[in-house]
């Protein structure tokens, strides 16, 4: 069998809302993946599991099941959304994200995704992780790749 390639493209959109009473930020983050099947037979994308971390804390998880099949030598682009919550011991972020005298409220999030594919009863898992900028101060739609955070290390928050 040839490889199945998973490429994390980036954040497609981030939609933000706030709970004033709880000083909580809700971010719905939609990500884009390209999955390429380099084989001469179809493969099933059985599930995608994703999680988002902020400052080493998991702030959101998602799982998509029975997603699609990819034909021989074909590629499919898949969007998936992770609902995230920034609250409690990170409620200081609410002050940053709702401070409107600054225009851009970029925070660095670590996106982790695992794709499980199956073919002929065989299962394969491919994982990727990437740091991405997301604006927590407003709803944002990104050009693919625009939100990428290029440094290897996550900055101090």
């Amino acid at each position: 069998p040839r490889s199945i390639d998973v490429k994390y493209i980036g954040v497609k959109s981030a939609y933000v809302s706030y709970d004033v009473q709880k000083r909580t930020i809700y971010l719905n983050i939609t990500n884009t993946l390209n999955i390429t099947n380099n084989n001469y037979y179809s493969v099933e994308v059985e599930n995608i599991t994703a999680q988002v971390q902020f400052a080493k804390t998991v702030i959101g998880k998602a799982r998509l099941n029975n997603i699609t099949h990819i034909g021989p030598l074909d590629m499919k682009q898949i969007d998936y959304t992770v609902p995230t919550v920034i609250a409690e011991e990170m409620s200081y972020m609410y002050d940053f994200c709702t401070l409107i005298s600054i225009k851009v409220h970029n925070i660095v999030l670590m996106m982790q995704v695992t794709v499980t594919t199956t073919y002929f009863g065989h299962s394969e898992q491919i994982s990727q992780e990437r740091y991405q900028y997301v604006d927590c101060g407003r709803n944002t739609t990104y050009q693919l790749g625009q939100s990428e955070y290029l440094n290897v290390l996550q900055p101090q928050q």
């Epitope: 002050d95 709702t98 409107i100």
Partner: antibody
């Protein structure tokens, strides 16, 4: 717990430069979204914002006084400084510093320091 | 600048009854993010101001739930459900929507 304390000369002569210090504890000015602001209150009157400084060193001044004000910080010493140039009797007031934040406004205030401009 | 307007004095109120204090802004304080950037402070006699309410409706830490706030984008009301002697002072509304941040002139709570 969060505390702030203002200090100043008490009395200053007209046309001099006034220096005020705000010493704080219980929070870090390295935290995103945090800042310290200066507010003054002439005796028997209302509150007036003077200046603010944020964690990222952004500074904002009340426009009518901007040419006379300078705000700065020493994060390692947990201190904020405000200088007011060319003071006159209209600057006589109680000066407060307060911890500010985007979401919560001025959540913590110092006890204030009273300034009298007199020759 | 956004002008915050308040009456200088409240209607005289009896201890244990409710009181309302009004504030009007010259421009809507409702931001496109859904948050209204209106704040209430109380300055008790001889003391520093203290934060009561942030972003129109969020009670500050340690503030009793006798205090509540609401309003539209430009007209706001602070309500005290059962006035106590310790509530006496000057109530200031303020806005953080636009620079410069501004305070209202303050409303003095009067007891009967």
């Amino acid at each position: 717990q969060v505390t702030l304390k203002e200090s100043g000369p008490g009395i200053v002569q007209p046309s001099q430069t006034l220096s005020l210090t705000c010493s704080f504890s219980g929070f870090s000015l390295n935290t995103l979204g945090r800042g310290v602001g200066w507010i003054r209150q002439p005796s028997g009157k209302g509150l007036e914002w003077l200046a603010k400084i944020w964690w990222n060193d952004d500074k904002f001044y009340y426009p009518a006084l901007k040419s006379r004000l300078t705000i700065s910080k020493d994060t390692s010493k947990n201190q904020i400084f405000l200088k007011i140039a060319n003071v006159d009797t209209a600057d006589s007031a109680t000066y407060y510093c307060a911890r500010i934040a985007g979401g919560t406004g001025a959540a913590y205030w110092g006890q204030g320091t009273t300034l009298t401009v007199s020759s | 600048d956004i002008v915050m307007t308040q009456a200088a004095f409240s209607n005289p109120v009896t201890l244990g009854t409710s009181a309302s204090i009004s504030c009007r802004s010259s421009k809507s304080l409702l931001h496109s993010n859904g948050i209204t950037y209106l704040y209430w402070y109380l300055q008790k006699p001889g003391q520093s101001p203290q934060l009561l309410i942030s972003q129109m409706s969020s009670l500050a830490s340690g503030v009793p739930d006798r205090f509540s706030s609401g309003g539209s984008g430009t007209d706001f009301t602070l309500r005290i459900s059962r006035v106590e002697a310790e509530d006496v002072g000057v109530f200031y509304c303020a806005q953080n929507l636009e620079l410069p941040w501004t305070f209202g002139g303050g409303t003095k709570l009067e007891l009967k």
